[in-house]
Structures are given as structure tokens and as C-alpha cells.
């Protein structure tokens, strides 16, 4: 059976697969997924290994028409480095010489300057090029190699291993060499895989059942450390509670060097955030941190300095802490907009069982703003999801130059932010460089400001506008209002009407359904339309909603189904990547972000059309 990293190398023109007959003969044969001799896999960014021989594809020289055979894998050899060229060409790195079928006289696979059909290769059973099943470095744990990546294949007691092994051990623990020759270099680490006993790599807090892994001897960059945690279905540490900080201070008390945690300001337009999307509501900075020096966007916990936090350049090599297990954040359920009939007094706006109102003209200090909201039967607004924030931005009449009090503050416990309405802090969205909590002035209250409505801490004594929120009172039967210019069941936003397509459909079916409604799969022109759509679908239980974006017409170039330019994107992390497909909006914790899916997957969708009676603005010229 093929494991997920293995593949057969297929030439469509001949309908045959590469077959490693022997180390000196790499030929082709009828494709057979059970044949070990036809299985290959990437073992580094640029090396392809034969699974049968645990040797790498290579050439004797970078010249035209030489045989491609198998060699002992050597990550430094220029003659074993391959790269995917445009579309399905595979070439030797840095040269226009390609992996080629050979010919009638030459049964062996050859290196050749021609780029025709005989030089085009796919993963058997797919339409993907060989790089779509690329190499993912596996960062080791413990051992003596400072967390370096596994080197596959590696030699142990004169035997080659292409996977983690428990050889030499009686306890079944899986390990790998971190250089190709363990016998000489003696460098190894344990693999970040599940096996009998691997739970003992974690320390479980008995109070919360959350587990922590302290990798004190590793030396990885922040991004590598995060990848290592993710390989164990975990994340870099987030700290949202004082108890958690206390537990970790104890766990790291015998250490001296800094350890990466998940706190970062890597998002271009927002402030400090945890990589696991926990809210940044508890602050434990080292005095003088965070320093505003550019590039210091990642954070380490300092065991030698009472486990306080310091921002550093992300490329520094440090140990790190991973976290996995229960999180208390998911216990607070926000009802989705469609679940709750929401009726509000005049001048208040409904959303998901609550009513909202901006007080822009009567500027008040935070305490007085809070009093006013409470007199009106509500509180300064709390915000629990990206959807709720996007509702406020896109539908409450929020303006880019606003600076408005919300209910978040750390008045009660310094450096521990809470909502004034007592609801749990499940979400934060700080402005770049925030929260700054400047030492020379107490910044205990929080405002929403700027075009995106992101947050900043502020001295509570500034007179500013504010946003109130209250539970909707009336629970009578919901009156379906027909929005002006839109048919029943459609929702209006600016010049357009939108409808959720409730049948699970492929991209093509969804597109057809919208067309039948004299509409089209939604386009998304800017951040404000995105905010509206996020609030429209983001809290719904379904995972995905089709948009009109795909690269089915031209692979690698994403286009809307209607003739409109792509002027705005909102990709999820690691998207769009190399895989072709159709674009859907995520819901839940990644609400509104775009993922590329296979176009024949089934999802709900959003249709869009011009509202009636709207004058079409002229198309922007480019």
C-alpha cells in the first residue's frame, strides 16, 4: 500500500510508470501500485528516493542525454537535485534539462533538453505534478540533535532506513538519524509521531487537562518550532489565564534559555496574536518589552526571568513549548444569526440575538459610556467572533475614522483583559503594535478604531464615542422583512442582494443554481464586502460556502465566474498553494478565510446580483 508521501511517476503519453529495475536501470513499466520498484518519494526539498532501493534519482553529469539512475542519497550533490518546472516538467535544478522517457533504442529514463510530452510526468492516478506530494521536514524531539529534522534515508548499523524506526530499542519508541550516517555522526532524535509511550513526552496540568511539551534543547526558528508542534497535532503555547502562566513558570523554573511561544505580530495589519487563535487577553511582558524594533515579531518565554515574555526576531534559534488538549474557549457558544429571531428597538441593529447601537456624537469617558449603555438595558459591546466584529464594521454604520469604546478592559486585574458584560474573552483583534499598555500612562480600556475596526488599549479618561449592545427582548415570531430592491429570502448589502444556497452542491452545480436565479456565485470586491459575507455565513454550522473564484479556466490563475477583475483576496494560511481548484469561504474559527477545494466537493454557496433600482457605478479603469 502507498503511504501518503509515496507516489508513482506517470507519463500520460505512454500510459506507463517509472520502474527502478536495479540501481543502474531506471526504466518504465505498466503501472502497478503494489510494485515497490515503482514507488518514489521526496526525501528533501529536491531529492527523490526510490522506496525499493532507498537510493536517490540522479545523473552522472548535467549534460544532455545521460541516463538517470540511482545513487546513495547525498543532500549536497548537485546531480540529485530536481525541481518542478512549469506544469508537469521535472528538471535537474538550475538547468533546462528534463526527466525524459527515453526512446525505442534507450529503455532507460534519460536527462534531455526536450520539453515535449515525453518529458511530462504526473503522480499516477492524479492530474498533479510530482511536487504536489512534496517533502515535509519532520522535526525531531529530545535526542541529541537540537531538534534537527530527520534525514531520510539514514544509515544505522550499516542498514538504511527510509522511515522512523525503533531499531536498537526495547520500548518501541520511534527515532531517526538527523544526518544520513548515524553510525558516524551519532546524531538522532525521536519522531513526532503517535506510538506506545509517546504521551510521556507531555506534561499534563491536572487542573485543566491541558498538556505541554517543553523542548528545551532544541534550536529552531519560530516558524520551525510552530511546524514541529503542528506535526504533533498541537500548537505553540498560548497563555490566556494567570493559572496557566503560574503552571508554566513552575514547569520551566530549572531552565535558563528562552523558549518560543505562539505569541506574534506577523499579521501585516493586526497586532499581537496567539498562533492557535486564542484571544490575547493576558499580558506578561518583560519590562521593556515588547520592543518596537522592526522585525522583532515573535515572542519567547524567559525561564530565567520569571517566565516573562520578550519579543525577538523570528529567525533566532531557540527551544520551544507546545500545547495540546482541552481549551476552555470553546465552551461559550454564540448562536448563529439564523438561529435567533432578533427584534430591536428603533435605532438599534439586530444580529444573532443581540441589538447594537453606535453613539458617535455624544463623547464620553469609558466609565460614563458604560453607565449610559447599562441605563439603556445593555452594556458596552463585547465581541466574541470575527463575524460579530464584521457585522459591526459592515452593517452598523461604523466609519474608518471612528474611535469608539468597547467593553474590554483590564481595570479589575492589571494585564488581564475582561469584558464589562461578564462574558468570557474568546476573541481579540488588536491593531498593529497593540495592546501597547504604555507604562507612562495607564491604558486600561479598549477602543475600536481605524478602517478595519481593530482594537487598541487607551486611557479610560478620554471622551470618545461608544458602542452599546443588549440582548434582544422580543422573542415573537420572526417577521421576514423583504429588503428594498431584493427578493424575499435575499439579503441586501450596499448595491447587491445575496442569498445562501442551501443545497450541498459542487462548484458547477452551485454556479448553475445561481444562474437559474438570474444571479452568479458571489464575487468579493473589497474588505467591506468580505466583512459582510463573513458576518452573513461565518457562524453557520456548515464548514464551507462556495464563492465564484476558481482557476479551472487557467491553472494557477484565479478568476471569478463573471468577467470581473480579482482586486481583493482573503486567503487562509498556506492558500492558495499549488493545488488547482475552486474557492470556498470557511466558517468557524477561520471565519471568512478562503480555501481552495476540489471543485467536485459539495458545499453550500452564496449567490449575488445587483439590487433592483440601483444605478450601476462605472467600472473602475486600470
Amino acid at each position: 500500500l502507498l503511504d501518503t508521501r509515496q507516489f508513482l511517476i506517470y507519463n500520460e503519453d505512454h500510459k506507463r510508470c517509472v520502474d527502478a529495475v536495479s540501481p543502474s536501470a531506471v526504466q518504465t513499466a505498466a503501472c502497478n501500485q503494489d510494485a515497490e520498484s515503482q514507488k518514489f518519494r521526496w526525501v528533501s526539498e529536491s531529492q527523490i528516493m526510490s522506496v525499493a532501493f532507498k537510493l536517490c534519482l540522479g545523473v552522472p553529469s548535467k549534460t544532455d542525454w545521460v541516463a538517470i539512475t540511482l545513487y546513495a542519497c547525498d543532500s549536497k550533490s548537485e546531480f540529485q537535485k530536481w525541481e518542478c518546472k512549469n506544469d508537469t516538467l521535472l528538471g535537474i535544478k538550475g538547468e533546462d534539462l528534463f526527466f525524459n522517457y527515453g526512446n525505442r533504442q534507450e529503455k532507460n529514463i534519460m536527462l534531455y533538453k526536450g520539453s515535449g510530452l515525453w518529458s511530462r510526468w504526473k503522480i499516477y492516478g492524479t492530474t498533479d505534478n510530482l511536487c504536489s506530494r512534496g517533502y515535509e521536514a519532520m522535526y525531531t524531539l529530545l535526542g541529541n540533535a537540537n531538534g534537527a529534522t530527520c534525514a531520510f534515508p539514514f544509515k544505522f548499523e550499516n542498514k538504511w532506513y527510509a522511515d522512523c524506526t525503533s531499531a536498537g530499542r526495547s520500548d518501541g519508541w520511534l527515532w531517526c538519524g538527523t544526518t544520513t550516517d548515524y553510525d558516524t555522526d551519532k546524531l538522532f532524535g525521536y519522531c513526532p509521531l503517535k506510538f506506545e509511550g509517546s504521551e510521556s513526552l507531555w506534561n499534563k496540568d491536572p487542573l485543566t487537562s491541558v498538556s505541554y511539551q517543553i523542548n528545551s534543547k532544541s534550536a529552531l526558528t519560530w516558524h520551525q518550532a510552530r511546524k514541529s508542534c503542528q506535526q504533533q497535532n498541537a500548537e505553540l503555547l498560548s497563555i490566556t489565564e494567570i493559572h496557566e502562566q503560574t503552571y508554566l513558570t513552575g514547569l520551566t523554573s530549572s531552565l535558563t534559555s528562552g523558549l518560543w511561544i505562539g505569541l506574534n505580530s506577523l499579521s501585516f495589519n493586526s497586532g499581537w496574536q496567539w498562533s492557535d487563535r486564542s484571544p490575547f487577553r493576558y499580558l506578561n511582558w518583560l519590562p521593556g518589552s515588547p520592543s518596537a524594533e522592526p522585525g522583532k515579531s515573535c515572542v519567547s518565554l524567559n525561564p530565567g526571568k520569571n517566565a516573562k515574555w520578550e519579543n525577538l526576531e523570528c529567525v533566532q534559534k531557540l527551544g520551544y513549548i507546545c500545547k495540546k488538549g482541552n481549551t476552555t474557549l470553546n465552551s461559550f457558544v454564540i448562536p448563529s444569526e439564523s438561529d435567533v429571531p432578533t427584534h430591536c428597538p428603533s435605532q438599534w441593529w439586530p444580529y444573532a440575538g443581540h441589538c447594537y447601537k453606535i453613539h458617535r456624537d455624544e463623547k464620553k469617558i469609558q466609565r460614563d459610556a458604560l453607565t449610559t449603555c447599562r441605563k439603556e438595558g445593555g452594556d458596552l459591546t463585547s465581541i466574541h467572533t470575527i463575524e460579530e466584529l464584521d457585522f459591526i464594521i459592515s452593517q452598523l454604520g461604523y466609519e474608518p475614522n471612528d474611535e469608539l469604546w468597547i467593553g474590554l478592559n483590564d481595570i479589575k486585574i492589571q494585564m488581564y483583559f475582561e469584558w464589562s458584560d461578564g462574558t468570557p474573552v474568546t476573541f481579540t483583534k488588536w491593531l498593529r503594535g497593540e495592546p501597547s499598555h504604555e507604562n507612562n500612562r495607564q491604558e486600561d480600556c479598549v477602543v475600536m478604531k481605524g478602517k478595519d475596526g481593530y482594537w487598541a488599549d487607551r486611557g479610560c479618561e478620554w471622551p470618545l464615542g461608544y458602542i452599546c449592545k443588549m440582548k434582544s427582548r422580543s422573542q415573537g415570531p420572526e417577521i421576514v422583512e423583504v429588503e428594498k430592491g431584493c427578493r424575499k429570502g435575499w439579503k441586501k448589502h450596499h448595491f447587491y442582494c445575496y442569498m445562501i444556497g442551501h443545497t450541498l452542491s459542487t462548484f458547477a452545480e452551485a454556479n448553475q443554481t445561481c444562474n437559474n436565479e438570474n444571479a452568479y456565485l458571489t464575487t468579493i470586491e473589497d474588505r467591506y464586502e468580505q466583512a459582510f459575507l463573513t458576518s452573513f455565513v461565518g457562524l453557520r454550522p456548515e464548514k464551507y460556502f462556495w464563492t465564484g473564484l476558481s482557476d479551472i479556466q487557467t491553472k494557477g490563475t484565479f478568476q471569478w465566474t463573471i468577467e470581473e477583475e480579482v482586486r481583493f483576496t482573503h486567503w487562509n494560511s498556506d492558500m492558495p498553494g499549488r493545488k488547482p481548484g475552486c474557492v470556498a469561504m470557511r466558517t468557524g474559527i477561520a471565519g471568512g478565510l478562503w480555501d481552495v477545494l476540489k471543485c467536485d466537493e459539495k458545499a453550500k454557496f452564496v449567490c449575488k446580483h445587483w439590487a433592483e433600482g440601483v444605478t450601476h457605478p462605472p467600472k473602475p479603469t486600470t
Epitope: R169, D171, S200, S216, K217
Partner: nanobody, 127 residues
């Protein structure tokens, strides 16, 4: 950068108990196999007990089996040696030692060549 500090030694009567502690600083405990050794006056140093870095499998010298128990606390970064039913022949300087991991694990950590040593602590059993 790895340092080991023993504590908990002293003078006790035969049949009594002591608990020795070995605190590791510089790195977390799970990178090291930890062994307890002892050296009585005029004798060779001998392995008493050891505990492997992962999985926590323990080994004991025949002379202490059933009386001594080794354990580790990763949170405190400390290994303990609980010594019950002490005998005069247990009198010695007790050392804890740490060995960096290797892929070999045959269940016996007494054969290990330990890299780091504590300074030792005196245990005297006398009536």
C-alpha cells in the same frame, strides 16, 4: 550547562528511611537517563539504580532490589531515590549522574557511560 545537585542525605539508624533528591538544571529532565551511584570508603563506585529518560523504566542493583525505589518528577525536574530498610552496608557517598540519550534502549541503564555528575552526598547508616 547541565548541573546536578543532590540533597536529602544524612545519618540514620538501621531499618530507617531516607529520600535522596537529584535536581537537574540547564535542561529538562526528559533529555537524560539518570543514575544513582555510590562509593563506600575503600571500594569501587557501583551503580545503585537508574531511570530511563523516556518511558521511565527503572533498574536496580541486586543489593537494593525491593528496598530502594527510583522515580522522576518532570515538573520539578528532579529524580528521587527512596531508600527504605537501610542497612549499615548502604553507608556511602551517593552520586547522581545524567547521560544524554542514545537510540539504544535495552531496558538497562546501569551500563550507561554517564556524561554529567553531581558532587555527591553522604549517607550514613549506623546505630
Amino acid at each position: 550547562q547541565v548541573q546536578l545537585q543532590e540533597s536529602g542525605g544524612g545519618l540514620v539508624q538501621p531499618g530507617e528511611s531516607l529520600r535522596l533528591s537529584c535536581k537537574l538544571s540547564g535542561f529538562t529532565l526528559d533529555y537524560y537517563d539518570i543514575g544513582w551511584f555510590r562509593q563506600a570508603p575503600g571500594k569501587e563506585r557501583e551503580g545503585v539504580s537508574c531511570i530511563s529518560s523516556i518511558g521511565g523504566s527503572a533498574n536496580y542493583a541486586d543489593s537494593v532490589k525491593g528496598r530502594f525505589t527510583i522515580s522522576r518528577d518532570n515538573v520539578k525536574n528532579t529524580v528521587y531515590l527512596q531508600m527504605n530498610s537501610l542497612k549499615p552496608e548502604d553507608t556511602a557517598i551517593y552520586y547522581c549522574a545524567a547521560e544524554a540519550q542514545t537510540p539504544y534502549n535495552d531496558g538497562d541503564c546501569t551500563r550507561a557511560s554517564y556524561d554529567y555528575w553531581g558532587q555527591g552526598i553522604q549517607v550514613t547508616v549506623s546505630s
